[in-house]
């Protein structure tokens, strides 16, 4: 049903092979990616409430597909996972608090996160860091999951399996 308005290959936005997405836009795609569909000549990426398409041979398309296949994107893009061991300042944490990459069920916590993400980048201070530098963003919203996963999809339970020493300090939740 390629080209169909109602089918899985309908595109809300088409990105030309001549002008690949910026790094910032790629980060946004990684964060909000929910699914992809292979169409005849292009791939459609389903995000939270919109879709974007790109040519099947475009490097950024292959990168995003691989990212979702390995559950490193979408709900799995865990920039604010409570029980992380490493937090590097080179990649700003901008995502859902879960290891799970799929979610057909949206909990109130997920909806809160989605709301916050539209304006701010939530981060989580981590108590035991293995990296050289500690990342602190005092002016940004902080969500503390208290070791609970906020996704209902695959791998959602991973964060609960970490030893207590990996958990970050309790953080203040502020939503405006």
């Amino acid at each position: 049903n390629e080209g169909s308005v109602t089918g899985s290959c309908y595109c809300g936005k088409r990105i030309s092979s001549d002008s690949p997405p910026s790094v910032q836009f790629m980060n946004r795609l990684r964060k909000h990616l929910r699914a992809y569909h292979r169409c005849l000549y292009y791939t459609r990426f389903q995000l939270l409430s919109w879709s974007v398409c790109g040519g099947n041979k475009d490097p950024w398309v292959q990168e995003l597909m691989s990212c979702l296949d390995l559950k490193e994107c979408g709900h799995a893009y865990s920039g604010i996972v409570a029980h992380q061991k490493h937090l590097l300042p080179t990649s700003p944490p901008i995502s859902q608090a879960s290891e799970g990459a799929s979610s057909d069920i949206h909990t109130p916590a997920q909806m809160l996160l989605s709301t916050l993400q539209s304006t701010q980048r939530p981060t989580l201070p981590v108590g035991s860091l293995s990296s050289d530098k500690e990342l602190t963003r005092p002016n940004e919203t902080t969500i503390h999951t208290a070791g609970h996963s906020l996704a209902a999809g695959p791998e959602a339970g991973e964060n609960q399996k970490q030893p207590e020493k990996n958990a970050g300090p309790t953080a203040r939740t502020s939503a405006t």
């Epitope: 691989s66 390995l70 490193e72 996972v81 990459a101």
Partner: antibody, heavy 118, light 113 residues
């Protein structure tokens, strides 16, 4: 050609430490999710640990049996993964395999033997 | 944790015959994000590491003979070895990589009659 080469195994006394290395080549290491899997002689396969990619802050996950004793890390600039094993127990005796999960499949190394014995 | 139940535990087949190994997971391995099943099949011979035969439940790894076929979806999967050869004598494992911890089936030992 994809290659994963483990090293660092050997004989160690209970309570001792070892650091395993896994040198990778033939694929984009930084995009791969790395895991360690072990196999005791004549037994089945047991997952040990996992480390995610840089966009996910190299988050690590461990089997309950090794939590608090093993530490998984990676150096993307060297295409190498490491497993630091402390407080080793006799039940940790096994062949340790480094694996790389990519969208093109799960690659395995030849393994390195860890023997914990007094 | 996802439990992988493999059957049979051993299988004796004559050369040229077809061998069928089953694997059942305690929960679905189909991921809605890409409609892929997160299941792999391995072959392991004595003294060697596991060799990947099939991933995404049905995708044959490069270099693997086409007599090895993976099928199934959701919770029920099958590895079929058509026209079994002497070199197929090995232990075969299924593995789910849908969730951490990765879990493996108990293995199926394929012997030649």
């Amino acid at each position: 050609e994809v290659q994963l080469v483990e090293s660092g195994g050997g004989l160690v006394q209970p309570g001792g430490s070892l650091k395993l290395s896994c040198a990778a080549s033939g694929f984009t290491f930084s995009n791969a999710v790395m895991n360690w899997v072990r196999q005791a002689s004549g037994k089945g396969l047991e997952w040990v640990a996992r480390i995610r990619t840089k966009p996910n802050n190299y988050a690590t996950f461990y089997a309950d049996s090794v939590k608090g004793r093993f530490t998984f890390s990676r150096d993307d600039s060297k295409n190498t993964a490491y497993l630091q094993m402390n407080s080793l127990k006799t039940e940790d005796t096994a062949m340790y395999y480094c694996t790389a999960w990519t969208t093109e499949g799960i690659y395995w190394g030849q393994g390195t033997l860890v023997t914990v014995s007094s | 944790d996802i439990v992988m139940t493999q059957s049979p535990s051993s299988l004796a087949v004559s050369l040229g015959e077809t061998a069928t190994i089953n694997c059942k997971s305690s929960q679905s391995l189909l991921y809605s994000g890409n409609q892929k099943n997160y299941l792999a099949w391995y072959q392991q011979k004595p003294g060697q590491p596991p060799k990947l035969l099939i991933y995404w439940a049905s995708t044959r790894q490069s270099g693997v003979p086409d007599r090895f076929t993976g099928s199934g979806a959701g919770t029920d999967f099958t590895l079929t070895i058509s026209s079994v050869q002497a070199e197929d004598l090995a232990i075969y494992y299924c593995q789910q990589y849908y969730d951490t911890p990765w879990t493996f089936g108990g293995g199926t030992k394929v012997e030649i009659k």
